[in-house]
């Protein structure tokens, strides 16, 4: 029977409350991470003047942060679903070491830094289920990651602040590009 207007629907609603589709879940997971990044960026920008700094290039030389390029097939021109998906997963795996670096970089947002890291791991799992060509995904070498982490942590305070800012900015850009691409799939 129809639900009387204004009353909460019980039996009528139940069949419609299906779980989120894989695409809906991935979309929401990315936006969840982006929300966390915006909170972390707020703390970074409030704490230092890195967000207005013009000296980013100095620190960027130390970093090899994943970026989307034309060849990755994620842009509207030359879009390629499988190539793009491999790039997104590979990029996220490469970002993991940088997210680990962020873990001790926040005072008031420590839990949020952890949530971003954990949510990213979950996102990678969702995307790996979606990918057909898992063999094409290269996993970063743990030894290389460990030495990179040591190197980043040994930087002076200014460089560490700049590195934090650059990681957050790059990760945000990478996720935004990924979100646009995934919405086309």
């Amino acid at each position: 029977a129809p639900v009387p207007p204004g009353e909460d629907s019980k039996d009528v609603a139940a069949p419609h409350r299906q779980p989120l589709t894989s695409s809906e879940r991935i979309d929401k997971q990315i936006r969840y991470i982006l929300d966390g990044i915006s909170a972390l960026r707020k703390e970074t920008c409030n704490k230092s003047n890195m967000c207005e700094s013009s000296k980013e290039a100095l620190a960027e030389n130390n970093l090899n942060l994943p970026k989307m390029a034309e060849k990755d097939g994620c842009f509207q021109s030359g879009f390629n679903e499988e190539t793009c998906l491999v790039k997104i997963i590979t990029g996220l795996l490469e970002f993991e070491v940088y997210l680990e670096y962020l873990q001790n970089r926040f005072e008031s947002s420590e839990e949020q830094a952890r949530a971003v890291q954990m949510s990213t791991k979950v996102l990678i799992q969702f995307l790996q289920k979606k990918a057909k060509n898992l063999d094409a995904i290269t996993t970063p070498d743990p030894t290389t990651n460990a030495s990179l982490l040591t190197k980043l942590q040994a930087q002076n305070q200014w460089l560490q602040d700049m590195t934090t800012h650059l990681i957050l900015r790059s990760f945000k850009e990478f996720l935004q590009s990924s979100l646009r691409a995934l919405r086309q799939m």
Partner: nanobody
């Protein structure tokens, strides 16, 4: 046990307003993304609006500028203020919660009817 309890649905004339509420229990509300979905008879479910722990929001194009989602972490409640309602907004509206591990939960739904 997770519970999402919606209220505020009803019959309203075109151009009118309604405010939906969803009270959550059994989840760590402050770390959950909260959203409203709707489903009209014979149509696909669609995301109306969602709001994340630090306040980022997203709206369906069809409701932008008319609907506003907000949350009160102290009351474990999410709201959907719906203004300038149209007949095409008639649907069952569901509250939805989503946590960073990818777990999600649904309310039972509340009916919104826009009719003259």
């Amino acid at each position: 046990e997770v519970q999402l309890v919606e209220s505020g649905g009803g019959v309203v004339q075109p151009g009118g307003s309604l405010r939906l509420s969803c009270a959550a229990s059994g989840i760590i509300f402050s770390i959950n993304a909260m959203g409203w979905y709707r489903q009209a008879p014979g149509k696909q479910r669609e995301l109306v609006a969602d709001i994340f722990p630090f306040g980022s929001t997203e709206y369906a194009d069809s409701v932008k500028g008319r609907f506003t989602i907000s949350r009160d972490n102290a009351k474990n409640t999410v709201y959907l203020q719906m203004n300038s309602l149209r007949p095409e907004d008639t649907a069952l509206y569901y509250c939805h919660s989503y946590d960073p591990r990818g777990d999600d939960y649904w309310g039972q739904g509340t009916l919104v009817t826009v009719s003259s």
